[in-house]
Interface confidence: low
């Protein structure tokens, strides 16, 4: 309740997160013309990426373009990219939608289609749908530890969400353990009324709100966080211009003294931790 006699001050906060969990990924791997099931293990270093600010990212799905080298090749025949003669291809032109610089030649992409040749990382990335179900759908069972230190400088008061008495094996529950700062990712989605399995395919942005409503008067002192969760991105993926949340990164390597890379389009959940609140004191 609002205490008008108190001097209020907004919270100053710092956040640190640690994600834990292992995922086993099974996907089709084509080698030597033979497609077989490949099994790989993903640990924290494979699926999380350091982000700036109060955010962390968990990869839930991906599309790989393996063995790319810098050379000349036909660009991917996306809509409007096909050509029938060199006239359609402009030397030195960099189409923002393309993956390279045009050489001015119209060349066969495959037996039926021709596209402009580009100087690029080849073969150019194909426009593939994100795998369904998501490859790292088991990320639902990952946990994140959120460390949140707060400070009210005007009141010379500092505290944090993790208390010395807290059990390191607890899991947050709105009713049974509302002060535990270890959250199961699937539970976060459930609390926000979202389906993790569905969002994991294209990715999304989830907000973790930490609200501090602190009464710093010694006779009725109370300063503990309240956690709530809501989805922040446009969930109507069919209607939104660029659905979900994804980015690309590359792993570089040398093979027979030729620099190559594997391009990975990573889909996943960006968790934004939003800390707000006030501290009041007479």
């Amino acid at each position: 309740s609002d205490k008008l006699y108190q001097r209020k001050e907004p919270v100053i906060s710092s956040v640190h997160t640690k994600v834990k969990g292992i995922a086993e990924v099974t996907e089709n791997v084509t080698e030597g013309g033979v497609t077989k099931l490949g099994h790989s293990i993903f640990d924290t270093a494979d699926y999380t990426f350091p982000l700036q600010g109060n955010s962390f990212f968990v990869m839930t799905n991906y599309v790989k373009s393996e063995g790319q080298v810098q050379t000349l090749c036909p660009e991917y025949p996306r809509r409007g990219a096909q050509c029938s003669s060199d006239r359609r291809c402009k030397k030195g032109w960099m189409d923002p939608q393309s993956k390279g610089i045009q050489t001015g030649r119209c060349v066969p992409y495959d037996k039926t289609r021709k596209t402009c040749e580009v100087s690029a990382w080849c073969p150019t990335e194909e426009e593939k749908e994100a795998p369904r179900p998501a490859l790292l759908r088991s990320a639902e069972n990952f946990t994140v530890l959120i460390k949140n230190n707060i400070h009210f400088p005007g009141h010379n008061y500092t505290t944090r969400n993790i208390l010395p008495t807290m059990n390191g094996s607890c899991t947050f529950h709105k009713t049974w353990d509302p002060q535990c700062s270890i959250f199961r990712l699937g539970d976060i989605f459930q609390e926000a009324g979202e389906n993790f399995t569905e969002v994991a395919v294209q990715g999304g942005i989830m907000g973790i709100e930490i609200y501090w409503d602190c009464n710093l008067d010694s006779w009725s002192h109370h300063c503990r966080p309240r956690y709530s969760f809501r989805r922040l991105d446009d969930k109507n993926t069919d209607e939104s211009f660029v659905p979900g949340y994804n980015f690309r990164y590359a792993k570089y390597y040398k093979e027979n003294n030729v620099e190559k890379r594997t391009l990975i389009k990573a889909f996943g959940i960006r968790f934004d931790i939003l800390v707000f609140g006030t501290g009041g004191k007479f």
Epitope: V69, Y109, C122, P123, E255
Partner: nanobody
Framework: EVQLVESGGGLVQPGGSLRLSCSAS??????????MGWFRQAPGKELEFVAA????????YYADSVKGRFTISRHNPRNTVYLQMNSLRPEDTAVYYC?????????????????????WGQGTQVTVSS
């Protein structure tokens, strides 16, 4: 100097199988970043594309006439490409040539064009007859 050496040809009855091998050697040749292909030439006919396997991602390509019957594969550590030929027909009779396209020619996928390939083997004879 790059050398491609084919083996595995011979005489086989219709419906039978053969496995052709092609090994690549040579200091300047980067096998694992090359497109490898098989072509064939029947007496009095033009050189015909049979199958190819991409340098970068093991993608395979086949002529319509051999789809479902022939399988191309490669073994990088041994610098060898294979052509497994099943359900052979008399019209498959030809000299089979192994060809390689090194990355220095660019990554363009003209896999069914002989002009793409800059290295060729001497050929191995395949005869399908009863």
């Amino acid at each position: 100097e790059v050398q491609l050496v084919e083996s595995g040809g011979g005489l086989v009855q219709p419906g039978g199988s053969l496995r052709l091998s092609c090994s690549a050697s040579g200091r300047t040749f980067s096998f694992s970043t090359s497109t490898m292909g098989w072509f064939r030439q029947a007496p009095g006919k033009e050189l015909e594309f049979v199958a190819a396997i991409d340098w970068s991602d093991f993608n395979t390509y086949y002529a319509d006439s051999v789809k479902g019957r022939f399988t191309i594969s490669r073994h990088n550590p041994r610098n060898t490409v294979y052509l497994q030929m099943n359900s052979l027909r008399p019209e498959d009779t030809a000299v089979y040539y192994c060809a390689a396209h090194s990355e220095t020619r660019g990554g363009t996928r003209y896999f069914d064009r002989p002009s793409l390939y800059n290295y060729w083997g001497q050929g191995t004879q395949v005869t399908v007859s009863s």
